[in-house]
């Protein structure tokens, strides 16, 4: 056959679906690879062909669209399973072609099992709610296109294993779940089960997401440098190890990159002719506020090093701050025996 533009296996799209539930999968060609949509392709006389490779097999085979009750079907650029079976797992390929043009892409589909509490190997999306921030909602995800707007499905929400009813601050409102005020205790996995009829059959869609309650933007502040500070003086003798911690608190901020760094005499540490190492550790609070510590270490400090300016810098989306450490050379204690002897006129 003539050459086909093969976009390979699109591992960016790890599609996971639950066993015994409907699944609709759009051909990724039109979403990520080609600059035209299915309608344009169809009207230009291009045909979309589907085939697959079973799990642990190398043989590409056509998809059987003649199964009882049309279990697998294709509609425009969508491959439908009504419902899926465990052995539908494999790599699926959609190919767009006519006599002069050909383009194809493969993607992995994994059919996974869930238990009665909705636990499964499914990768769960995380939805962050701000703590004590007022009413916030989560929406049952990825259910568009499964049934027409004329169909009114029933939606049941669960937290973990438990049906949400008569919860203090969590109220099911159809496709939405409203949190009147979010607390740490609201952390957990939330599942919506959407039940709808189709051609005399009843289908269920199960969607689980993880809710994480995080710090509120109302309380967010620029980075706070706890150390170095004005109360601590790093007094060292030449030859000793100099250790200066820079400890910075960062409020949780959605999509903010938190950074801590040192400068020595206003320069990058590597630009100074000294053997300096910097080690970083990070810890998080329950609401994802972050504390970063960068310890600047000079194994054998010289008197020249003790005259330098050591500044800790911190930056987040809320701003940038800097604080200098107070570094001094230790003044040797007086040697009393000699000095007292001199005082008494001894020679």
């Amino acid at each position: 056959s003539e050459r086909c533009d093969d976009w390979g296996l699109d591992t960016m799209r790890q599609i996971q679906v639950f066993e015994d539930e409907p699944a609709r999968i759009k051909c990724p060609l039109f979403e990520h690879f080609l600059k035209f949509n299915y309608s344009t392709a169809h009207s230009a006389g291009l045909t979309l062909i589907w085939y697959w490779t079973r799990q642990d097999r190398d043989l590409e085979e056509p998809i059987n669209f003649r199964l009882p009750e049309n279990r697998i079907s294709k509609e425009k650029d969508v491959l439908w399973f009504r419902p899926t079976l465990l052995n539908d797992t494999g790599n699926y390929t959609c190919m767009l072609r006519n006599t002069t043009y050909c383009s194809k892409v493969a993607f992995p589909l994994e059919v996974v099992q869930k238990d009665s509490c909705f636990n499964s190997p499914m990768k769960l999306p995380v939805h962050k709610l701000y703590i004590e921030y007022g009413i916030q909602r989560i929406t049952c995800p990825n259910v568009d296109g499964y049934f027409p707007s004329s169909v009114k499905p029933t939606i049941t929400w669960y937290m973990g294993c438990y049906k949400i009813q008569n919860f203090n601050n969590v109220i099911p409102e159809g496709m939405n779940l409203s949190f009147l005020i979010a607390f740490i205790s609201n952390n957990g996995n939330y599942t919506c089960v959407v039940t709808y009829p189709e051609n005399g059959r009843t289908f269920h869609l199960t969607r689980t997401l993880t809710v994480k309650v995080v710090g509120s933007p109302k309380n967010a502040v620029p980075p706070v440098i706890h150390s170095p500070n004005d109360h601590v003086v790093y007094e060292k003798e030449p030859g000793e190890e100099l250790l200066i911690p820079c400890t910075v608190y960062f409020s949780f901020l959605m999509d903010s990159r938190n950074e801590v760094w040192w400068t020595i005499d206003g320069k990058k540490p590597d630009d100074i002719p000294i053997d300096v190492t910097i080690n970083e550790s990070i810890s998080h609070s329950r609401t994802e506020d972050e504390t970063r510590t960068q310890i600047l270490s000079i194994k054998k400090v010289t008197s020249e090093d003790l005259k330098r300016s050591y500044v800790c810098h911190a930056r987040s989306a809320k701003g940038e701050v800097a604080k200098a450490a107070t570094v001094k050379q230790k003044v040797p204690a007086p040697r009393y025996t000699v000095e007292l002897a001199c005082g008494f006129g001894a020679t």
């Epitope: 990159r257 760094w261 190492t277 990070i282």
Partner: antibody
Framework: QVQLVQSGAEVKRPGASVKVSCKAS????????MHWVRQAPGQGLEWMGW????????DYAQKFQDRVTMTRDTSISTAYMELSRLRSDDTAVYYC???????????WGQGITVTVSS | DIVMTQSPDSLAVSLGERATINCKSS????????????LAWYKQKPGQPPKLLIY???TRESGVPDRFSGSGSGTDFTLTISSLQAEDVAVYYC?????????FGGGTKVEIK
């Protein structure tokens, strides 16, 4: 001395992926961000993203978000950039460059030519 | 994204004369808390990677000749070559690193008149 040495030129077909490497020497690899910048033939410089080799954290330009993956191996002081679903307009010289936070990109790799052609 | 606009596109200057390149950012790139402008200037010769000349809009990178200087603040910046030398023939780029995606100007080609 401080240097970044990149892997050799690559020729790829549309739809394929390319993974290029950048080996750092002469400085503390984990102490500097590593950027990837590309330059199409006769064109200007385009920033693709950066990786913090210490934490592995990344920040990609929106344009490349769904196609680029930046990784590192601190044991061999090497950064990697993988670009998937290559198109002919990805033909360019790809540079790695280090920066100490907000001090500009002070050391650059020699660049690697990636040609995408059917 | 912050757009960086360089002018002119190209510049022909006699040896020993002053060359001035302008760069304008579509929004402020000064950090009010540190009073630093997050702007760098690079020089690129054909077939070579770029070379950092200036960071923080006006701080010269070590080893860069003092005929190169950077100035400006907020949204308007200038790179000046006080006395053009033959080895200064190159394309010059400005770049903002105030916020990601870090963006470059389109470049200014400097030639000898």
């Amino acid at each position: 001395q401080v240097q970044l040495v990149q892997s050799g030129a690559e020729v790829k077909r549309p739809g394929a992926s390319v993974k290029v490497s950048c080996k750092a020497s002469g400085y503390t690899f984990t102490g500097y961000y590593m950027h990837w910048v590309r330059q199409a033939p006769g064109q200007g410089l385009e920033w693709m993203g950066w990786i913090n080799p210490y934490s592995g954290g990344t920040d990609y330009a929106q344009k490349f978000q769904d196609r680029v993956t930046m990784t590192r191996d601190t044991s061999i002081s090497t950064a990697y950039m993988e670009l998937s679903r290559l198109r002919s307009d990805d033909t360019a010289v790809y540079y790695c460059a280090r920066s100490y936070y907000y001090y500009g990109m002070d050391v650059w790799g020699q660049g690697i030519t990636v040609t995408v052609s059917s | 994204d912050i757009v960086m606009t360089q002018s002119p596109d190209s510049l022909a200057v006699s040896l020993g004369e002053r060359a001035t390149i302008n760069c304008k950012s579509s929004q402020n790139i000064i950090n009010s808390s540190t009073n630093k402008n997050y702007l760098a200037w690079y020089k690129q010769k054909p077939g070579q990677p770029p070379k950092l000349l200036i960071y923080w809009a006006s701080t010269r990178e070590s080893g860069v000749p003092d005929r190169f200087s950077g100035s400006g603040s907020g949204t308007d910046f200038t790179l000046t070559i006080s006395s053009l030398q033959a080895e200064d023939v190159a394309v010059y780029y400005c770049q903002q690193y105030y916020s990601t995606p870090f963006t470059f100007g389109g470049g200014t080609k400097v030639e000898i008149k």
